[in-house]
């Protein structure tokens, strides 16, 4: 898609560059596998510049292709604690609303590890809300260098 | 932050785009957990375009939000070699100077694996020096496809 | 490298922004360790905007520094299935043609895990074809949230 002359003359900011890096606030109540995120300079090195938080979930405000990345570290963890469960603890990042666009974007299991980390490019639309679901009973670390979730707009 | 008319008229290079991809040079002496990096076309596919190296540590020369990424593979490694240690080998990336800005940005343990890889968005300032600390006695691979560390300026 | 006045005045599209996110199509026949990829909106959330596919391998059409990322999940996998093999299953991403530029860019072993994920910055040139080689007998998952491969042009 070509950029209009007006877009070329506006600051590059106006082209997009929406970006966010979030830290873990807390896990959900029982039966709610979602992780709840928070961000802002008062909290440390997390920030929201464009996207916004809606009850701890990340909402996109600009259409485009985004790089989505996540790292989650389990808080009290050893190779045995992750492997002794019948079902491995799994982390899934997906669009959870609007329901019509619901889809899993990124899925990782811990198996015998205590940290998962990955990233991917994906198209996102204004209003898409991203949820990060952690299945199982193991608790994620709230340390900001161990558990974080972010998106970066990379092109229209 | 709005970009000035002058900034808009300069080549996009001048907006930032600082970028570096480094390969492992060597580990530190005993009691120094830092990894020492090197970069430049003469060495292969590593490069520094903006950031610089100071005694093997990466120094930032432009304020902004950066994508920091790292992969470290242990050289002589099996699932048993990483799991039989009382403490898992751990890799931490952080700002180590200036001391007033010292903080851990990214932390991963190997547990029963032989490679860690992750990435995150973080604000960095001119003069920040990034250190990568590898705790434990296991040695990292110097293969350029197995161990590397990089940063990419993504926005002001 | 400075951008010409013409480049500055063209839409930002023309500066680069080549990008692709691919999903797994199939593995190769015996003796061919390559993974074969596919992309396009008809397939889901995968896409090619600049790079192109040549018999399931990704070919670069614009010189520059790229962020290359990959995640591969083994389909029928447990910690024991990856560890009981004498040689760990390994994934390597490299330039496979032209032969004169053949090199391994990124290498990861599964050890006792069932997913690998990583990313790196690397210079690529027009005509470089990237191959992703999976050694071993284990089969990768074709789920689009578990196995994907992408590149993003980040600067000249």
């Amino acid at each position: 898609q070509r950029l209009s002359r007006a877009q070329q003359q506006l600051p590059l900011e106006s082209l997009g560059w929406d970006i966010a890096e979030l830290q873990l606030n807390h896990t959900g109540p029982q039966q709610d596998p979602r992780l709840y995120w928070q961000g802002g300079p008062a909290l440390g090195r997390s920030f929201l510049r464009g996207p916004e938080l809606d009850k701890g979930q990340l909402r996109i405000r600009r259409d485009g292709i985004y790089m989505v990345h996540i790292q989650v570290t389990l808080a009290i963890c050893s190779s045995t604690s992750t492997s002794r469960h019948h079902h491995p603890t799994t982390l899934a990042v997906g669009i959870c609303s609007p329901a019509s666009r619901s889809i899993s974007l990124l899925r990782l299991s811990f198996h015998q590890g205590c940290t998962i980390a990955s990233q991917r490019l994906t198209p996102l639309a204004r209003g898409d809300t991203l949820c990060t679901n952690l299945t199982g009973t193991l608790l994620p670390s709230r340390n900001t260098d161990e558990t974080f979730f972010g998106v970066q707009w990379v092109r229209p | 932050q709005r970009l000035s008319r002058a900034q808009q008229q300069l080549p996009l290079e001048s907006l930032g785009w600082d970028i570096a991809e480094l390969q492992l040079n060597h580990t530190g002496p005993q009691q120094d957990p830092r990894l020492y990096w090197q970069g430049g076309p003469a060495l292969g596919r590593s490069f520094l375009r903006g950031p610089e190296l100071d005694k093997g540590q990466l120094r930032i020369r432009r304020d902004g939000i950066y994508m920091v990424h790292i992969q470290v593979t242990l050289a002589i490694c099996s699932s048993t070699s990483t799991s039989r240690h009382h403490h898992p080998t751990t890799l931490a990336v952080g700002i180590c100077s200036p001391a007033s800005r010292s903080i851990s940005l990214l932390r991963l343990s190997f547990h029963q694996g032989c490679t860690i890889a992750s990435q995150r968005l973080t604000p960095l300032a001119r003069g920040d020096t990034l250190c990568t600390n590898l705790t434990g006695t296991l040695l990292p691979s110097r293969n350029t496809d197995e161990t590397f560390f990089g940063v990419q300026w993504v926005r002001p | 490298q400075r951008l010409s006045r013409a480049q500055q005045q063209l839409p930002l599209e023309s500066l680069g922004w080549d990008i692709a996110e691919l999903q797994l199509n199939h593995t190769g026949p015996q003796q061919d360790p390559r993974l074969y990829w596919q992309g396009g909106p008809a397939l889901g959330r995968s896409f090619l905007r600049g790079p192109e596919l040549d018999k399931g391998q990704l070919r670069i059409r614009r010189d520059g520094i790229y962020m290359v990322h990959i995640q591969v999940t083994l389909a029928i996998c447990s910690s024991t299935s990856t560890s009981r093999h004498h040689h760990p299953t390994t994934l390597a991403v490299g330039i496979c043609s032209p032969a004169s530029r053949s090199i391994s860019l990124l290498r990861l072993s599964f050890h006792q895990g069932c997913t690998i994920a990583s990313q790196r910055l690397t210079p690529l040139a027009r005509g470089d074809t990237l191959c992703t080689n999976l050694t071993g007998t284990l089969l990768p998952s074709r789920n689009t949230d578990e196995t994907f491969f992408g590149v993003q042009w980040v600067r000249p």
Partner: antibody, heavy 120, light 107 residues
């Protein structure tokens, strides 16, 4: 078996500095997997976290004591230390050193505690 | 700081009794919550971590539950060695804080 052992004077005069050392055995502070904390317990009262140190020397202190507390580490001796300045009778307590995980603040190993009395 | 308020401050019970101790956090802390037992003259030891996980070696008569701000430690059948002081602690954010303690005495 991880063991922590506090040592230092049991009696300190008001306005002086309380100094204690914790020696760790069965574990290496430099391994980097844990925070090393000081916790105190006033006679017949609850537990109060004073602060922690990481092998790298980074610290975090309880704001209520921050202006008077310094925690340091000597990885070569596998020890960490507490200094509390300008003490008063209100600092009389049993002082414990303890280990907690980096990823989760669970105090899984403690010293046996040492009673420090502030009195002239 | 997050305040942790325990109740009761003391209770009397007999061997075989079912005992519950409560702890309230001044803000939501999720499952970042632990229980300790302290015998007279000894250091505390972990009973329950992450709200409801039993520490290795701790008898199964101890259990924990919670709702993010309200937490309960239950001893299903009190044993002679359970007469001690119990503390709650939050692991949500520094400064790490403890409850004031609950003393379980013999009736």
């Amino acid at each position: 078996q991880v063991q922590l052992q506090e040592s230092g004077p049991g009696l300190v005069k008001p306005s002086q500095t309380l100094s204690l050392t914790c020696t760790v055995s069965g574990d290496s502070i430099i391994s980097g997997g844990y925070y090393w904390s000081w916790i105190r317990q006033h006679p017949g009262k609850g537990l109060e976290w004073i602060g922690y140190i990481f092998y790298s020397g980074s610290t975090d202190y309880n704001p209520s004591l921050k202006s008077r507390v310094t925690i340091s580490v000597d990885t070569s001796k596998n020890q960490f230390s507490l200094k509390l300045s300008s003490v008063t009778a209100a600092d009389t307590a049993v002082y414990y050193c303890a280990r907690s995980g980096y990823s989760y603040a669970l105090f899984d190993h403690w010293g046996q505690g040492t009673l420090v009395t502030v009195s002239s | 700081d997050i305040q942790m308020t325990q109740s009761p401050s003391s209770l009397s019970a007999s061997v075989g009794d079912r005992v519950t101790i409560s702890c309230r956090a001044s803000q939501f802390i999720g499952r970042y919550f632990n229980w300790y037992q302290q015998q007279p003259g000894k250091a505390p030891k972990v009973l329950i971590y992450a709200e409801s996980s039993l520490q290795s070696g701790v008898p199964s008569r101890f259990s924990g539950s919670g709702s993010g701000t309200e937490f309960t430690l239950t001893i299903s059948s009190l044993q002679p060695e359970d007469f001690a002081r119990y503390y709650c602690q939050q692991s949500y954010s520094t400064p790490w804080t403890f409850g004031q303690g609950t003393k379980v005495e013999i009736k």
